[in-house]
């Protein structure tokens, strides 16, 4: 029932994701399924509004990040992405594309330097970065 | 619903070690980090560090880099802190606290420390 | 590490009067703020998050505000049970650090 994927341009090691649709999905054609969402790692270079843009186009958004239990193979990613986490001037606070507030619960953010947008990094990091950078992002959908 | 119960009171030695326990219950202990906190008599709140139960990742108040070790036993619930190479300056009251989503939205009810010979 | 400035360090005042508290953080904390009331021989409780949201059951006199580096918490029309200490707190990045508390004591 359980294959156990090495995506080695994507993960740090073996993550486990399930075979069958039934237990996972429907989702996109060759996006990644895991514990009820969707998930595809977009290689090219684009900058936090392009690659907002390109989720919607998918229907999709781009990642947020909401449980460390059901994502936590978000754990094991590689490198850094673009996530759906910007900073909003007007209520100094940063939040996710659907409005909500993050959590310091589910991120630790680490200001490496100024900008209004955040990167996804390895065991639930979230780096801050000019929205206006290029950088590979991660595209997200739930299933329920 | 959420309780956070802490070890009893210690009287130590200097130079001796104490560890404290903090057992929680009513809520999914792996999802929000726990924190501790220290009261010396008379005196502020002070942040010592807090741990991640999902995969205990720990970040400390520098002060407390050499003082403090946080731990945590998922299987029971709980988590520690182990003070080391005590003084009278660690006499205090140390409270653990679970991190909310935005806030220390419950603590414990604290464990005195005195330290004397 | 960002450090949280609070003042006063202490307080008098009467029932019925509004206070101010106020918490000046040495960098940008994004609203990331707590205020936490403590009563002698207490642990503390919340008292508003993310800098304005009052938390559960503490009553509308309270209200946060601020954004950026700077923020206070007002009481309006003190009753006798608000009397104690209060610390402002942040959640900004990897340390999280408590002010030195104001202690609001009965004129």
């Known amino acids: 029932i359980w294959s156990a994927v090495f995506l080695n341009s994507l993960f740090n090691q073996e993550v486990q994701i399930p075979l069958t649709e039934s237990y996972c999905g429907p989702c996109p054609k060759n996006w990644i399924c895991y514990k009820n969402n969707c998930y595809q790692f977009f290689d090219e270079s684009k900058n936090w509004y392009e690659s907002q843009a390109s989720c919607m186009s998918q229907n999709a958004s781009l990642l947020k990040v909401y449980s460390k239990e059901d994502q936590d193979l978000l754990k094991l990613v590689k490198s850094y992405h673009w996530m759906g986490l910007v900073h909003i001037p007007t209520n100094g606070s940063w939040q996710w594309e659907d409005g909500s507030i993050l959590s310091p619960n589910l991120l630790t953010i680490i200001e490496m330097q100024k900008g209004d947008c955040a990167l996804y990094a390895s065991s639930f990091k979230g780096y801050i970065e000019n929205c206006s950078t290029p950088n590979t992002y991660i595209c997200m959908q739930r299933t329920v | 619903q959420v309780q956070l119960q802490q070890s009893g009171a210690e009287l130590v030695r200097p130079g001796a070690s104490v560890k404290l326990s903090c057992k929680a219950s009513?809520?999914?202990?792996?999802?929000?980090?726990m924190n501790w906190v220290q009261q010396r008599p008379e005196q502020g709140l002070e942040w010592i560090g807090r741990?991640?139960?999902?995969?205990?990742?720990?970040h400390y108040n520098q002060k407390f880099k050499d003082k403090a070790i946080l731990t945590v036993d998922k299987s029971a619930s709980t988590a520690y802190m182990q003070l080391s190479s005590l003084t009278s300056e660690d006499s205090a009251v140390y409270y653990c606290?679970?991190?909310?989503?935005?806030?220390?939205?419950?603590w414990g009810q604290g464990t005195t420390v005195t330290v004397s010979s | 590490d960002i450090q949280l400035t609070q003042s006063p360090a202490s307080l008098s005042a009467s029932v019925g009067e509004t206070v101010t508290i106020t918490c000046r953080a040495s960098g940008n904390i994004h609203n990331y703020l707590a205020w936490y009331q403590q009563k002698q021989g207490k642990s503390p409780q919340v008292l508003v998050y993310n800098a304005k949201t009052l938390a559960d059951g503490v009553p509308s006199r309270f209200s946060g505000s601020g954004s950026g580096t700077q923020y206070s918490l007002k009481i309006n029309s003190l009753q006798p049970e608000d009397f104690g200490s209060y610390y402002c707190q942040h959640f900004w990045s990897t340390t999280w650090t408590f002010g030195g508390g104001t202690k609001l004591e009965i004129k």
């Open positions: 741990i991640d139960p999902y995969d205990s990742e720990t």
């Open positions: 009513g809520y999914t202990f792996t999802s929000y980090w």
């Open positions: 606290a679970k991190m909310g989503d935005y806030s220390f939205d419950y």
